[in-house]
Interface confidence: low
């Protein structure tokens, strides 16, 4: 159906497994960025790994169901886990096409959700998911 949500799809080489079963991958003609049309939700997600002052994308794609947070228009990540010392996984959910391509800002790992706190920014014209 034409009203299906479309998200940016990306999986870092080191990520074990794939979420591509949650949608239909669209052949954009180039390797990056890739897009995925969601099968089970109208919600995109993004996962970034913040190490010191550098953010690297881990995964981007479709969520498997519409959950709280999916109503957000933009990707506003919140800290979720610490996979290793000095690094923090930030995740976002959002409910507009390609909303997971980038984030507005990352709060510092030590102060999750602090209003106005600014984490690493994308340089003008640079997409965060290209950090890899």
């Amino acid at each position: 159906p034409p009203n299906r949500r479309t998200c940016v799809f990306f999986e870092a080489p080191g990520v074990r497994g794939s979420t591509k079963t949650l949608g239909e991958l669209l052949d954009t003609g180039t390797e990056l960025p890739r897009a995925i049309r969601c099968l089970y939700s109208r919600c995109c997600f993004g996962i970034w790994n913040l190490t010191q002052d550098r953010a690297q994308v881990e995964m981007q794609g479709c969520r498997d169901s519409d959950e709280p947070g999916c109503e957000s228009l933009h990707c506003d990540p919140s800290p979720r886990a610490h996979p290793s010392p000095g690094s923090t996984l930030f995740t976002c959910s959002c409910g507009t096409d390609f909303c997971n391509a980038n984030y507005s800002h990352l709060p510092p790992p030590g102060s999750p959700g602090t209003p106005g706190s600014q984490g690493p920014q994308a340089a003008p014209g640079e997409s965060i998911w290209m950090a890899l």
Epitope: R16, G17, S18, T19, L22, A81
Partner: antibody, heavy 129, light 110 residues
């Protein structure tokens, strides 16, 4: 230990339906998906589809769409595969396999394709008149 | 007709190294990881290699996998009689939105 135990041999008439069960033990059923494969006599493996035991999402092989239904019962840690309108060429050994681990909450229970790491013993289905 | 192409047979003597190839396309092996399964006659398949080159616990390090472009290969070194089996490669296929298998390679230990 981690095990998948399938239901027994079935003999069916053309046009009938068959429903095979696959009971999981030794792991948290809803943390994984289940894939179904089949193998016709003397032939290779064919993937039929998968179901997420976490939320019931399914993905069927295109050639079987409309004839196959996969379900799970988390209360009994059992997966089911029903194939309808059976034909002679559906005669095969049918396998269930644990497939794809869901994330630890970070990934919201999405399905990962990592290969099938635990297989059932197989169920022989013969379609014969 | 299997989507992934494997040689129907391979053979070797005990102690030898044998390689089994698996050829695909951009939509499967080209973009996705490859898994290998071993099936001893009359038994269910067993996961041998996942994510191109990872061995599940319990699989001897004599088995190794690799991938390059749209092809993959399984190497078995120090061949043993118990390695006699059918070997299948598999990968996710983006176009078919499903898992595809190779036709299988029957390995004979002479």
């Amino acid at each position: 230990q981690v095990q998948l135990v399938q239901s027994g041999t079935e003999v069916k008439r053309p046009g009938a339906s068959v429903k095979i069960s696959c009971r999981a033990t030794g792991y948290t059923f809803s943390d994984y998906g289940i894939s179904w494969m089949r193998q016709a006599p003397g032939q290779g493996l064919e993937w039929m589809g998968w179901i997420s035991a976490y939320n019931g999402n399914t993905n069927y092989a295109q050639k079987l769409q409309g004839r196959v239904t996969m379900t799970t019962d988390t209360s009994t840690s059992t997966a089911y595969m029903e194939l309808r309108s059976l034909r002679y060429d559906d005669t095969a050994v049918y396998y269930c396999a644990r497939d794809g681990r869901r994330g630890s909450g970070i990934y919201w229970g999405v399905y990962y394709y990592n290969g099938m790491d635990v297989w059932g013993q197989g169920t022989t289905v013969t379609v014969s008149s | 007709q299997p989507v992934l192409t494997q040689p129907p047979s391979a053979s070797g003597t005990p102690g030898q190294r044998v390689t089994i190839s698996c050829s695909g396309s951009r939509s499967n092996i080209g973009r996705n990881t490859v898994n290998w399964y071993q099936q001893v006659p009359g038994m269910a398949p067993k996961l041998l290699i996942y994510s191109n080159n990872q061995r599940p616990s319990g699989v001897p390090d004599r088995f190794s996998g690799s991938k390059s472009g749209t092809s993959a290969s399984l190497a078995i070194s120090g061949l043993q009689s118990e390695d006699e089996a059918d070997y299948y490669c598999a990968a996710w296929d983006d176009s078919l939105n499903g898992v595809v298998f190779g036709g299988g390679t029957k390995l004979t230990v002479l």
